[in-house]
């Protein structure tokens, strides 16, 4: 591993659409990939009238937008579906929203999902 880089080997997995997609609902996903590729964790969620609904969590493969991010933070301004990615084992257990376009001091909305259970 490159010095200073947090190697991602596994991520929290969740799929709200698990019945339609025919996957596990929750678990811990081992992250595989080509040797020359970096591995990340991600989370996607929706904000429905102030209520956080997680869509998916899991491994995300070699994406420059995720490099050296220890925290999973969405920075886009009011997306339809929120997305963040990070490096480090299980770094997607918590995620937050800090919109870059805000002029005023942004407020964090950290979300801690329920711990994973194996089906």
């Amino acid at each position: 591993a490159i010095l200073g880089r947090s190697e991602t080997q596994e991520c929290l997995f969740f799929n709200a659409n698990w019945e339609k997609d025919r996957t596990n609902q929750t678990g811990v996903e081992p992250c595989y990939g080509d040797k020359d590729k970096r591995r990340h964790c991600f989370a996607t969620w929706k904000n429905i009238s102030g209520s956080i609904e997680i869509v998916k969590q899991g491994c995300w493969l070699d994406d420059i937008n995720c490099y050296d991010r220890t925290d999973c933070v969405e920075k886009k301004d009011s997306p339809e579906v929120y997305f963040c990615c990070c490096e480090g084992n299980m770094c997607n257990e918590k995620f937050s929203y800090f919109p870059e376009m805000e002029v005023t001091q942004p407020t964090s909305n950290p979300v801690t999902p329920k711990p994973p259970y194996y089906n």
């Epitope: 799929n15 997609d21 596990n24 990939g33 996607t44 995300w60 493969l61 994406d63 997306p79």
Partner: antibody, heavy 120, light 107 residues
Framework: EVQLLESGGGLVQPGGSLRLSCAAS????????MHWVRQAPGKGLEWVSS????????SYADSVKGRFTISRDNSKNTLYLQMNSLRAEDTAVYYC?????????????WGQGTLVTVSS | DIQMTQSPSSLSASVGDRVTITCRAS??????LNWYQQKPGKAPKLVIY???SRASGVPSRFSGSGSGTDFTLTISSLQPEDFATYYC?????????FGGGTKVEIK
């Protein structure tokens, strides 16, 4: 080097059956989900079916549901597609492809394809 | 099902041209958008995944952009080996769906 090699295609009459195989090498087969994607002559790509790393979950396109069955034998590093009640519209090149993660972020490696022709 | 609409369906260009292909999803797919290149008689080859990431061995002249519903594949300087058909594909949910393809032909 990752390699996927399909076989089992051929000419079959409407209503007939065929079993396609996809032999995998160059990677840890039992760690990856796998897919079948088809392409009718002169047409675009159509997803057919997928199976997770251990065979516990399978999914199908509506057009093949109830007629096709995807399976895998991890001890043989082989993916299968059992096709029954074949129709003329199933005529296509069938590709197997590897899913990059559990939730299928992308299909990173593909086989060369095997042609299935359904005709009387 | 999520519909993927690609445009144009075909285009003619010369070596050295900048080429742009667009793909629109019928609903937000975040960054779950991939681009594949296919040459006649060959299997598709992954070019771009997660909207912006280049696959292994893909030249830097290929780039992807976009998120949500609108995405773009750009070839900055078209080379002879780039003449092919390009497909976008969403992997946000099953069934996985592809765009209709864009055939890049020699002018």
């Amino acid at each position: 080097e990752v390699q996927l090699l399909e076989s089992g295609g051929g000419l079959v009459q409407p209503g007939g059956s065929l079993r396609l195989s996809c032999a995998a090498s160059g990677f840890t087969f039992d760690s990856y989900g796998m897919h079948w994607v088809r392409q009718a002559p002169g047409k675009g790509l159509e997803w057919v079916s997928s199976i997770n790393y251990n065979g516990g979950y399978t999914s199908y396109a509506d057009s093949v549901k109830g007629r096709f069955t995807i399976s895998r034998d991890n001890s043989k590093n082989t993916l299968y597609l059992q096709m029954n009640s074949l129709r003329a519209e199933d005529t296509a090149v069938y590709y197997c492809a590897r899913a990059a993660t559990w939730h299928d972020t992308h299909l990173d490696y593909w086989g060369q394809g095997t042609l299935v022709t359904v005709s009387s | 099902d999520i519909q993927m609409t690609q445009s144009p369906s075909s285009l003619s260009a010369s070596v050295g041209d900048r080429v742009t292909i667009t793909c629109r999803a019928s609903q937000s797919i975040v960054s779950y958008l991939n681009w594949y290149q296919q040459k006649p008689g060959k299997a598709p080859k992954l070019v771009i995944y997660a909207a912006t990431s280049r696959a292994s061995g893909v030249p830097s002249r290929f780039s992807g952009s976009g998120s949500g519903t609108d995405f773009t594949l750009t070839i900055s300087s078209l080379q002879p080996e780039d003449f092919a058909t390009y497909y976008c594909q969403q992997s946000y949910e099953n069934p996985l769906t592809f765009g209709g393809g864009t055939k890049v032909e020699i002018k």
